[in-house]
C-alpha cells in the first residue's frame, strides 16, 4: 500500500509479492522522488486499489508495457 509522506509525495516502503493479472490493472505511475527510500511503480486496479510493485521485476515491466500500449490504442 502506498504511503503519502506529505501532500506532494507518495512513497512505497514494501512491494507486493504477488503477480497481478494485467486484466485487473487500469493504470500505473512511477515513483522516483528522492524523498522515498526506493523507486517504485504504483498500479491502480480496476476497482481503484493502489498497489506498490518493484520496477525491477519482469512482470511489472511487462504490465507497464501492456498498459502503455493499451493507453495509446484507440478503443473501438
Amino acid at each position: 500500500q502506498p504511503d503519502a509522506i506529505n501532500a506532494a509525495v507518495t512513497c512505497c516502503y514494501n512491494f507486493t509479492n504477488r503477480k497481478i493479472s494485467v486484466q485487473r490493472l487500469a493504470s500505473y505511475r512511477r515513483i522516483t522522488s528522492s524523498k522515498c527510500p526506493k523507486e517504485a511503480v504504483i498500479f491502480k486496479t480496476i476497482v481503484a486499489k493502489e498497489i506498490c510493485a518493484d520496477p525491477k521485476q519482469k512482470w511489472v515491466q511487462d504490465s507497464m508495457d501492456h498498459l502503455d500500449k493499451q493507453t495509446q490504442t484507440p478503443k473501438t
Epitope: R30, T32, S34, P37, K38, E39, K56, D68, Q72
Partner: antibody
C-alpha cells in the same frame, strides 16, 4: 539527499584501460540501476550501459559490448565503469546516473577522460 | 535501435519568448520520453519524464507533450537561467538513446 560523487580526471595512453568510480550517498544502490553515459567534447550524450547492483545483471549498448565492464559494490555503495582498448575517440566526460526506469534523475559530476599519446 | 531526431539544433530567443523544441523517434515509444537541460561544464538535469511529468522542483514554465513518435518541450516564457542545451531521451528500450541536442542562445 541523493549524491553521486565520481573519481577524478584521467589521462590515458591509446590501448590502455580506465576505471571510473561513482560513490552514492542518500540512496541504497541495490534498489536502483546505475547507468553510465558519456559526452565527447562539444558532442551529445551517449548511453553506454547499466548495472543492477542487486544481482550484477548488466546491459550495454552493443557499440561498447566487449570493451566496457560495469561493476558495483553494494557494501560501499559504489559503481564502477572500466573501458578498455582506449582510442582518441574515447576522450569524453563520463557520467554515472541512477534510474530504474531508464531515465536519469540523479547524475554524478562527471569524470574527464583524455586519451592521448 | 531507436533513433531520436531533435530539432532545431540551435535557436536564438529573447527573455519572455515562448520556445518549442521537438523530438521524433523512429518508432512508437509509448510516451517513454525524458527531457534534460545541460549547462556548460555541468551534468544534465532531468526536467520531464514520461513525456509530460514535470520533475520535482522544475518550474512550471516547462511542459512536455506528444505521443507515439512525436514529442515537444515547451518553455512558456524564457528566463535568463534557461539559456542552455536541451536533450530528449527515449527510455522505451535499451540501448537508451538521446536526441542530438538543441542549444538555446540569447538573441
Amino acid at each position: 539527499q541523493v549524491q553521486l560523487v565520481q573519481s577524478g580526471a584521467e589521462v590515458k595512453k591509446p590501448g590502455s584501460s580506465v576505471k571510473v568510480s561513482c560513490k552514492a550517498s542518500g540512496l541504497t544502490i541495490s534498489h536502483t540501476y546505475m547507468h553510465w553515459v558519456r559526452q565527447a567534447p562539444g558532442q551529445g550524450l551517449e548511453w553506454m550501459g547499466r548495472i543492477d547492483p542487486d544481482n550484477h545483471n548488466t546491459k550495454f549498448d552493443p557499440k561498447f559490448q566487449g570493451r566496457v565492464t560495469i561493476t558495483a559494490d553494494t557494501s560501499t555503495s559504489t559503481a564502477y565503469m572500466e573501458l578498455s582498448s582506449l582510442r582518441s575517440e574515447d576522450t569524453a566526460v563520463y557520467y554515472c546516473a541512477r534510474g530504474v526506469f531508464g531515465f536519469f534523475d540523479h547524475w554524478g559530476q562527471g569524470t574527464t577522460v583524455t586519451v592521448s599519446s | 535501435d531507436i533513433q531520436m531526431t531533435q530539432s532545431p539544433s540551435s535557436l536564438s530567443a529573447s527573455v519572455g519568448d515562448r520556445v518549442t523544441i521537438t523530438c521524433k523517434a523512429t518508432e512508437d515509444i509509448y510516451n517513454r520520453l525524458a527531457w534534460y537541460q545541460q549547462k556548460p561544464g555541468k551534468a544534465p538535469k532531468l526536467l520531464i519524464h514520461g513525456a509530460t511529468s514535470l520533475e520535482h522542483g522544475v518550474p512550471s514554465r516547462f511542459s512536455g507533450s506528444g505521443s507515439g513518435t512525436d514529442y515537444t518541450l515547451t518553455i512558456s516564457s524564457l528566463q535568463p537561467e534557461d539559456f542552455a542545451t536541451y536533450y530528449c531521451q527515449q527510455f522505451r528500450s535499451a540501448p537508451y538513446t538521446f536526441g542530438g541536442g538543441t542549444k538555446v542562445e540569447i538573441k
